[in-house]
């Protein structure tokens, strides 16, 4: 029962984590304009992995996609790759783990096969979570580097009385979503790996002992009953609830206004 619970919980946690990774990847707020040095700006800039946006105080938001592939920084490409790999691995892991769930019966699938599938999906979730955490961390590091570089150059280009304040970017909401989601996927993967140990048929070192009764010769093998009858398995169709992670990229600050590209 504890194994089923651990496996089921691992699946749900990973599902939420992967939904979060997808949400973070799609979000536009990976980096947002730092307003510390310019709190009176009427124009707010923010950037995602796929496009950059400008929200005016009038409520209008303009987003422009990065239509170049070669012109983008290598780090951004690397972050994109890490996030996509994380999503793909996570999606495959989810697919595998559905069939590995102890509460779902598929033909006469052996427990050993389910254990292997659970381990496979667990490893996939762990790698998926690590990819997401790595991707978000690389982007965060890039932001920190650029932040301090632009701080150092803050007032270069000051000519006479004219001030040119350089736009600095700080951590956006997507980074925190990505870190949390990656962590959840990682935890879910670890739970699946733990569940795998409990699912695997226990091979004992005891030799099969023959008991001779009068007129009958029956051999009992330890663990045989459990293996043959499917004892302890949950045969009910257990519903997995997906909370439905929603992406709040806030491309638009006012619902009644239209975005234009």
């Amino acid at each position: 029962m504890a194994v089923t619970a651990c496996q089921g919980l691992g699946f749900v946690v990973s599902l939420i984590g992967i939904a979060g990774i997808i949400a973070a990847t799609c979000m536009d707020q990976w980096s947002t304009q730092d307003l510390y040095n310019n709190p009176v700006t009427a124009v707010f800039n923010y950037q995602g992995l796929w496009r950059s946006c400008v929200r005016e105080s009038s409520g209008f938001t303009e987003c422009r996609g990065y239509f170049t592939l070669l012109g983008l920084p290598a780090m951004l490409q690397a972050v994109r790759a890490l996030m996509i790999v994380g999503i793909v691995l996570g999606a495959i892991g989810l697919l595998v783990s559905i069939f590995a769930l102890k509460c779902i019966r598929i033909g006469s699938m052996e427990d050993s096969a389910k254990a292997n599938m659970t381990l496979t999906s667990g490893i996939m979730f762990i790698v998926s979570g690590l990819c997401a955490i790595a991707g978000v961390s690389v982007f965060a590091n890039m932001l920190v580097t650029n932040f301090w570089m632009s701080t150092a150059n803050m007032y270069t280009g000051m000519g006479g009385m004219v001030q040119t304040v350089q736009t600095r970017y700080t951590f956006g909401a997507a980074l925190f979503v990505g870190w949390v989601a990656g962590g959840l996927t990682l935890i879910g993967g670890v739970m699946m790996c733990i569940a795998c140990r409990g699912l695997a048929p226990e091979e004992t070192n005891y030799k099969a002992v023959s008991y001779h009764a009068s007129g009958h010769s029956v051999a009992y093998k330890p663990g045989g009953f459990k293996a043959s009858t499917g004892f302890g398995s949950n045969t009910k169709n257990k519903k997995i609830y997906d909370g439905g992670a929603r992406t709040e990229d806030e491309v638009q600050s006012y619902p009644s206004k239209h975005d234009y590209v």
């Epitope: 700006t41 009427a42 800039n45 400008v54 005016e56 009038s58 303009e62 422009r64 304040v165 006012y254």
Partner: antibody, heavy 118, light 113 residues
Framework: EFQLQQSGPELEKPGASVRISCKTS????????MNWVKQSNGESLEWIGY????????RYNQKFKGKATLTVDKSSSTAYMQLKSLTSEDSAVYYC???????????WGQGTTLTVSS | DIVMTQSPSSLTVTAGEKVTMSCKSS????????????LTWYQQKPGQPPKLLIY???TRESGVPDRFTGSGSGTDFTLTISSVQAEDLAVYYC?????????FGSGTKLEIK
């Protein structure tokens, strides 16, 4: 057609308060910020502040904080500006204007003349 | 606050002439995020409210005659009327739309001979 219809001219005594209205029609009132602008005796323009009719959020020019209060009535698609503790300095033409792309003001009311005199 | 300085304060021209007026801001109005300048030009005729002519420094508002052209970037901006008409008699204001509080220039009064 878009319209911003402002209330008529006002004559007030110093120290009094006044409320100017700006009734809109022809567009989604909650979809656009409403700005208020002051023009003293045909001189230059001064931005007072704006209100977001959807959320009710406001942003004021520091100079007019405590002097002007911006409100809206969504049901009648009307924006209001209340001016308190009036002095002769407040005598001016006040305009309401709708926010547009680039934070520009695309539609303006006809203006409300406020005269503060004892 | 960003200070907007307009010049000349007034100018008198004959119909058909080309006119340019200047607007300078104390800070750059260029937004790096979309490479747009948050400067607006308005026309105010006597006894009327201001009318939007140009936003984003160079984008002409719909219905505005193409003789009106906005140009410039950063801190220096220009409004050009290629061939002045009698109906262009007005005061022209530039406005900072980049930083709070939104500030207006003192205006350029255009008079026709």
């Amino acid at each position: 057609e878009f319209q911003l219809q402002q209330s008529g001219p006002e004559l007030e005594k110093p120290g009094a308060s006044v409320r100017i209205s700006c009734k809109t029609s022809g567009y989604s009132f909650t979809g656009y910020n409403m700005n208020w602008v002051k023009q003293s005796n045909g001189e230059s323009l001064e931005w007072i502040g704006y209100i977001d009719p959807y959320y009710g959020g406001t942003r004021y020019n520091q100079k007019f904080k405590g002097k002007a209060t911006l409100t809206v009535d969504k049901s009648s698609s009307t924006a209001y500006m209340q001016l308190k503790s009036l002095t002769s300095e407040d005598s001016a033409v006040y305009y309401c204007a709708r926010s547009y792309y680039g934070n520009a003001f695309d539609y303006w009311g006809q203006g409300t003349t406020l005269t503060v005199s004892s | 606050d960003i200070v907007m300085t307009q010049s000349p304060s007034s100018l008198t021209v004959t119909a058909g002439e080309k006119v340019t007026m200047s607007c300078k801001s104390s800070q750059s109005l260029l937004n790096s995020g979309n490479q747009k300048n948050y400067l607006t030009w308005y026309q105010q005729k006597p006894g009327q409210p201001p009318k939007l002519l140009i936003y984003w420094a160079s984008t002409r508002e719909s219905g505005v005659p193409d003789r009106f052209t906005g140009s410039g970037s950063g801190t220096d901006f220009t409004l050009t009327i290629s061939s002045v008409q009698a109906e262009d008699l007005a005061v022209y204001y530039c406005q900072n739309d980049y930083s709070y509080p939104f500030t207006f220039g003192s205006g350029t009064k255009l008079e026709i001979k």
